[in-house]
């Protein structure tokens, strides 16, 4: 987890003198309580931004949003403190809103953002918004929390982003499987344009199972310079194996950008139908 | 997690013999295809050998003959054996579960006189 860029991020609006600063996540009002405090914040919402970085990079960002409450604690509020979880990991990162000067009620009902947290494709994060000072001990909560799930790299927007790219997600290996007589699979892919191996790796699961059966891993070869963009043709023995007959062909790429975690393509085999058996005639006619 | 402990590297002279091993913390061993690949100085990773659940090997060309890669799913462990080494074969031996994409730490073997 990280903050897009390190230039100055501002939360001042009109009305509103506001700083942001870096947070260890522990407020001093946790250690210290205060006797008054705001109440949490309203309507939280979360949505997936993108932004530039200053070299021109495209990253996905939380873009985060809220409103405040209208009552009086707002004369209270001296900030309000953002965490970001991610939740594979329990990584977090925290910045603080910390406001310089008095809020006062206005005609509009006061709104905040922040779309600085970078994260990461097909990740889970909560989000939480803290209202500063944090409660005493026994006061009501007064933060809000959502979790935001990133989609992955296939999704259109994602694909285009920097760190998608880097993992190979502009490749695309329109890969086809076909079954074969004597036990085999026919993989067929589109090679990329760079000089670099990919491994071929089937699982087979018997039908309805999770359980696999069989598997086999082919590893192909750099292509040269006159292959790229063709199509690679590999023909892979099954074993022999009764209902092992569900496979799964996965397809992970040695791209420079992304070495041994670059993004794989799948496709899978089912099962041939089973014919329905048909209801056996009777070699007598009842009579009733 | 599956944890990888590898061992048997070392250093070697040309026409010499190593065997890498490498132990796999899982359940489901007997149910994984298993790989070695290796990674000389400034080069890219470059595949070695790897072997299916039905015991069947594959070989890179630059090793095939010398190298024998094999399995005992009793003991969660594939072996390289490295037979009649020569310089090139110098590089950090890494043991691979394509199915999760884990990497062992690596071991280096050094082949020279």
């Known amino acids: 987890l990280r903050l897009l860029d390190h230039r100055a991020l501002v939360c001042s609006q009109p009305g509103l003198n506001c700083t942001v600063k870096n947070s260890t996540c522990l407020d001093d009002s946790w250690i210290h309580p205060r006797n008054l405090t705001p109440s949490s914040p309203k309507d939280l919402q979360i949505q997936l931004h993108f932004a530039h970085t200053q070299q021109g990079d495209l990253f996905p960002v939380a873009h985060i949003e809220w409103t405040l409450q209208t009552d009086a604690s707002i004369l209270y509020l001296e900030g309000a403190e953002l965490s970001v979880l991610q939740l594979n990991t329990n990584e977090r990162l925290c910045v603080r809103f910390e406001f310089l000067s008095k809020l006062r009620h206005h005609h509009r009902r006061w709104r905040f953002t922040f779309s600085h947290f970078v994260v990461d494709p097909d990740q889970e994060y909560e989000v939480t918004v803290h209202h500063l000072p944090k409660p005493i001990p026994d006061g009501d909560p007064n933060h809000q929390s959502k979790n935001f799930l990133v989609p992955d790299c296939e999704h259109a927007r994602m694909k285009v982003t920097t760190p998608c790219m880097s993992s190979g997600s502009l490749w695309d290996p329109n890969i086809t499987v076909e079954t074969l007589e004597a036990h085999q699979l026919r993989v067929s892919f589109t090679l990329w344009n760079e000089s670099t191996h990919y491994q071929i790796l089937l699982t087979s699961f018997p039908h309805m199972e999770n359980h696999s059966c069989f598997e086999h891993m082919h590893h192909i070869p750099a292509p040269r310079p006159e292959e790229f963009h063709q199509r690679s043709n590999v023909t892979l023995t099954l074993r022999n194996l009764k209902g092992c007959c569900r496979h799964q062909v996965q397809i992970q790429p040695f791209f420079s950008s992304c070495l041994n975690d670059c993004l794989r393509h799948s496709a899978t085999v089912s099962c041939p139908e089973m014919p329905d058996t048909p209801e056996p005639i009777p070699d007598y006619m009842p009579l009733w | 997690e599956v944890q990888l402990v590898k061992s048997g590297g070392g250093l070697v002279q040309p026409g010499g013999s190593l065997r890498l091993s490498c132990a796999a913390s899982?359940?489901?061993?007997?149910?994984?295809?298993m790989a070695w690949y290796r990674q000389a100085p400034g080069k890219q990773r470059e595949f070695v050998a790897t072997?299916?659940?039905?015991?069947?090997?594959n070989y890179a060309d630059s090793v095939k003959g010398r190298f024998t890669i094999s399995r005992d799913n009793t003991k969660n462990t594939i072996y390289l054996q490295m037979n009649s080494l020569k310089p090139e074969d110098t590089a950090v031996y890494y043991c691979?579960?394509?199915?999760?994409?884990?990497w062992g730490q690596g071991t280096q073997v050094t082949v020279s006189s």
């Open positions: 072997i299916n659940t039905g015991g069947q090997p």
């Open positions: 691979n579960v394509p199915r999760y994409n884990y």
């Open positions: 899982t359940s489901i061993f007997s149910s994984l295809a």
